[in-house]
Interface confidence: medium
């Protein structure tokens, strides 16, 4: 693994992909989604220590300024770098439809 | 303003563009950047309450799951939606170079 992928806080503590099981009720979708009834939501969770999975120059700057001015500038944040598509079967006024969402499930993560 | 742009926490408390003045020394660049000597770093800072500047479906899901499982799922995070370019004049092994960075200064912000 690159240096930027080794978590200095211990295994699993830094920014990475997590899976959270959620029902349609959990997601607030019960009224308009028919299927699936449960979703394995992949999302980005974890700390962003210095040099860990820095997305770009902006993330580097943010970390440097956070160290200097922690009360003003927050640390970089763990967010999706890309997404996996997901199809939902939805209720519509006329019946049902299949809708592909390209921005629903995180595929991989980085720090911004 | 759209509902998603009205901050329920009070003016300026939610995710928005902030400007932070930083010297090359602050950024750790003094040895390899010639010019400019200071940068007005634009970055995204602020809270992401429900429905505020949600970037996509993933952000909606994250907020819903955060309310259900706050210890497991963090709230959405304020990050750049796009960037402004910036030129740095840099020292190189062979002399100097002009480098345009497309991912250095945040242009606008959203919650992911």
């Amino acid at each position: 693994a690159r240096n930027g992928d080794r978590c200095p806080l211990g295994p699993g503590r830094c920014c990475r992909l997590h899976t959270v099981h959620a029902s349609l009720e959990d997601l607030g979708w019960a009224d308009w989604v028919l299927s699936p009834r449960e979703v394995q939501v992949t999302m980005c969770i974890g700390a962003c220590p210095s040099q860990f999975r820095e997305a770009n120059m902006h993330a580097q700057i943010k970390m440097n300024l956070h160290r200097l001015k922690p009360d003003t500038v927050p640390a970089p944040c763990c967010v999706p770098a890309s997404y996996n598509p997901m199809v939902l079967i939805q209720k519509t006024d006329t019946g049902v439809s299949l809708q592909t969402y390209d921005d629903l499930l995180a595929k991989d993560c980085h720090c911004v | 303003a759209r509902n998603g742009d009205r901050c329920p926490l009070g003016p300026g408390r939610c995710c928005r563009l902030h400007t932070v003045h930083a010297s090359l020394e602050d950024l750790g660049w003094a040895d390899w950047v010639l010019s400019p000597r200071e940068v007005q770093v634009t970055m995204c800072i602020g809270a992401c309450p429900s429905q505020f500047r949600e970037a996509n479906m993933h952000a909606q899901i994250k907020m819903n799951l955060h309310r259900l499982k706050p210890d497991t799922v963090p709230a959405p995070c304020c990050v750049p939606a796009s960037y402004n370019p910036m030129v740095l004049i840099q020292k190189t092994d062979t002399g100097v170079s002009l480098q345009t960075y497309d991912d250095l200064l945040a242009k606008d912000c959203h919650c992911v």
Epitope: - | L24, L34, S35, R37, E38, V39, I89, L98
Partner: antibody, heavy 119, light 107 residues
Framework: EVQLQQSGPELVKPGASMKISCKAS????????MNWVKQSQGKNLEWIGL????????IYNQKFKGKATLTVDKSSTTAYMELLSLTSEDSAVYYC????????????WGQGTSVTVSS | DIQMTQSPASLSVSVGETVTITCRAS??????LAWYQQKQGKSPQLLVS???NLADGVPSRFSGSGSGTQYSLKIISLQSVDFGSYYC?????????FGGGTKLEIK
Amino acid sequence: EVQLQQSGPELVKPGASMKISCKASGYSFTGYNMNWVKQSQGKNLEWIGLINPYNGGTIYNQKFKGKATLTVDKSSTTAYMELLSLTSEDSAVYYCAREVRLGNAMDYWGQGTSVTVSS
Amino acid sequence: DIQMTQSPASLSVSVGETVTITCRASENIYSNLAWYQQKQGKSPQLLVSAATNLADGVPSRFSGSGSGTQYSLKIISLQSVDFGSYYCQHFWGTPWTFGGGTKLEIK
């Protein structure tokens, strides 16, 4: 008070070289870049290049590479520009100008040094 | 190199009038532009940086505007001390070229 004091006017022969000085005072010399600008016939302004006194780095307008050499002496807070192999085309007023820290404009200028190249 | 085209080249106006000087860049310079004033026999003086930021001590009758490739310097209610030459300069990639200048003369 920020001041940039340049050396006096020069009359030099074609083919000769010469060095213009720019003594900086009233601010932290290494904290600001120094630029050099040429003005011909009281009109056209041309950027020659800059030097970063903190790390010694220089960048030149390609047009002046080999014509101008920029240096600094941190101990005396003085910037120098050496002009090489002078021709009549080099007759002009030359300015040193401090670069603002934030961004790249030039906020303080020397009084200018008039250089006349003539045999 | 980026070319800076300044217009007009000269302008004859009366005290109290409003003038606008424009500068067009040959490509997008992302507001990395300064304006200078130069009096006869004197060094240039910074008026505006980053396209719109008035330099310290510059009267509020001066204002800079623009984006992309088009920029302007506006002087309202011209005073006798405002007469002289004005130059724009870009800072987007080197060389940092200047416009050809605008000479502002008293009518």
